[in-house]
Interface confidence: low
């Protein structure tokens, strides 16, 4: 059920009006069929209606547009381009609408769009120019401040013959349009790695959520340029250890809070630097909850309670005795 507010009096369009108005130009600020509208609250909700396309007759006053729980499949170029433009649209939520393709320029002509949520869509084909709108090497800056892309990974059999991480990163970096992005959420996307150049080109980031992925290592990732970063969520990944370079970079960020819970930390000799760092640092939230997963003899030991004597490595076997 749609939330209501004292600030809003939602008017609903009856489904039978759809065919009646489609042949003629839309009335000014009418409410699209299958949607609920509140001019006072500048809000349009077309939620759980199985819509297959973005309504053409969105009212010009809309600031908050909820198109969740539909069956949109494709967002074409200019999906929200209107005449006059939707100049006030600031928050656009398209989560859970079965989108599998977002084309170049899908969000063009939305000069005030600050918050975009594409979560829970199986995006097999995200154009590199979905957010930048053009293939210029430097595009006009996007007004986006928050981009929510949680659980957009398609099923294995629907992925193109390319890296999903690479596809997403290409869209984030195209034309350097997202230089003003402050919040980026990429949770639950089966990311195995983070391409090394992505963070360097998003210098305004305050909040980065990479939780519930499959990140094994941050060795080639640099956080050095993210001087404004306030929260870094790395919970529920496959991290084994953080190495010195990463530790130093994180420690050098003035406002950072790092979340590292539920990673399979390997407590051997390579963990010594991280344990020392954990004991000294204030940047890791809930650091007392971090426990070893491997080797077996160390399982469930608290990292903060380890000392150098606990952290040993088995001697390397000669090649003739090694097994795969």
């Amino acid at each position: 059920s749609s939330p209501t507010s004292s600030a809003s009096s939602f008017s609903s369009s009856a489904p039978f009006l759809a065919s009646a108005v489609s042949a003629q130009p839309p009335l000014p600020d009418q409410c699209p069929a299958l949607c609920e509208c509140s001019e006072a609250a500048r809000t349009v909700k077309c939620v759980n209606r199985n819509l297959t396309e973005v309504p053409t007759d969105l009212p010009a006053y809309v600031r908050n547009l909820f198109l969740t729980g539909n069956q949109l499949a494709v967002l074409p170029a200019g999906a929200f381009a209107r005449r006059p433009p939707l100049a006030e649209l600031a928050a656009l939520n398209l989560s859970g609408s079965r989108l599998d393709e977002v084309r170049a320029g899908a969000f063009e002509h939305l000069p005030s769009l600050r918050q975009l949520d594409l979560s829970h869509n199986p995006l097999a084909d995200l154009s590199p120019f979905a957010f930048s709108g053009s293939n210029a090497s430097v595009s006009a800056p996007s007004p986006l401040v928050e981009l929510i892309l949680n659980h957009i990974v398609p099923p294995e059999d629907e992925r193109q013959n390319r890296s999903f991480e690479g596809m997403v990163v290409a869209a984030l970096l195209a034309g350097r349009a997202l230089q003003g992005l402050r919040r980026l959420e990429l949770a639950s996307n089966h990311f195995l790695y983070l391409p090394r150049d992505v963070l360097a080109q998003l210098p305004s980031l305050r909040h980065l959520d990479l939780s519930n992925n499959s990140l094994v290592s941050l060795t080639y990732v640099s956080f050095r340029n993210l001087t404004h970063l306030e929260s870094l969520h790395l919970e529920d990944n496959a991290l084994k250890v953080l190495h010195n370079g990463t530790l130093a970079e994180l420690q050098g960020l003035p406002h950072i809070r790092v979340f590292l819970d539920n990673n399979p930390w390997v407590c051997d000799c390579h963990m010594a630097d991280m344990v020392t760092w954990l004991k000294e640092t204030e940047v890791v939230q809930g650091k007392d909850r971090l426990t070893c997963a491997y080797p077996e003899k160390m399982r469930n030991r608290v990292l903060l309670e380890l000392n150098s004597a606990d952290l040993d490595c088995d001697p390397i076997l000669p090649p003739s005795l090694q097994t795969s």
Partner: antibody, heavy 121, light 107 residues
Framework: EVQLLESGGGLVQPGGSLRLSCAAS????????MSWVREAPGKGLEWVSA????????YYADSVKGRFTISRDNSKNTLYLQMNSLRAEDTAVYYC??????????????WGQGTLVTVSS | DIQMTQSPSSLSASVGDRVTITCRAS??????LNWYQRKPGKAPKLLIY???SLQSGVPSRFSGSGSGTDFTLTISSLQPEDFATYYC?????????FGQGTKLEIK
């Protein structure tokens, strides 16, 4: 009827901790961003922190960043503010408020009655 | 962060007067501005949102205008219950700041 009821305020020493709660009723809690606003004695309203409906996004005023943590339990219709390393200047009445609209185009349409936090030795 | 500056800080007026309070933003905030009324011992109350929209249940003597950096709250004919402190708040920025308040007192 929308209702917001704060609790958890009280007297605490500098450096201490306190956890405020805000019990919400009368609306679909998980659909709305929520926030904490405070008013110190003789001072104006100060926006403290906000959190999205899902709880995935948090926002903090510079004055409390790193010391306060906002959270919510949508199954219990409850908003929280964990306040650590409290200072005398955190003394205030703390209000929870409901946001209407997307975070960047929002307004606070319902407010609780507030709970007093006093930080003093 | 975006700074909000209200003027005047305090103001004396009589019942029936027309009163205007202004709010200036340190950068353009489009029309992402709200006005609240605060009375001692009471929770703040939303009066105007999105610069000019009157909140449900608020008397029509209250009105808001402005866009960009300069905004105005007007009370067309002051009533005894209107003596309070008024705050503007921007929600354009990443952090949602209030003005310092304008205290409206009886002359």
């Amino acid at each position: 009827e929308v209702q917001l009821l704060e609790s958890g305020g009280g007297l605490v020493q500098p450096g201490g901790s306190l956890r405020l709660s805000c019990a919400a009723s009368g609306f679909t809690f998980s659909s709305y961003a929520m926030s904490w606003v405070r008013e110190a004695p003789g001072k104006g309203l100060e926006w403290v922190s906000a959190i999205s409906g899902s709880g995935g996004s948090e926002y903090y005023a510079d004055s409390v960043k790193g010391r306060f943590t906002i959270s919510r339990d949508n199954s219990k219709n409850t908003l929280y503010l964990q306040m650590n390393s409290l200072r005398a200047e955190d003394t205030a009445v703390y209000y929870c408020a409901r946001y209407y609209g997307g975070y960047y185009s929002a307004w606070m349409d319902y407010w609780g009655q507030g709970t007093l936090v006093t930080v003093s030795s | 962060d975006i700074q909000m500056t209200q003027s005047p800080s305090s103001l004396s007026a009589s019942v029936g007067d027309r009163v205007t309070i202004t709010c200036r933003a340190s950068q353009s905030i489009s029309s992402y501005l709200n006005w609240y009324q605060r009375k001692p011992g009471k929770a703040p109350k939303l009066l105007i949102y999105a610069a000019s929209s009157l909140q449900s249940g608020v008397p029509s003597r209250f009105s808001g205008s402005g866009s960009g950096t300069d905004f105005t709250l007007t009370i067309s004919s002051l009533q005894p219950e209107d003596f309070a402190t008024y705050y503007c708040q921007q929600t354009y920025g990443y952090l949602h700041t209030f003005g310092q308040g304008t205290k409206l007192e009886i002359k």
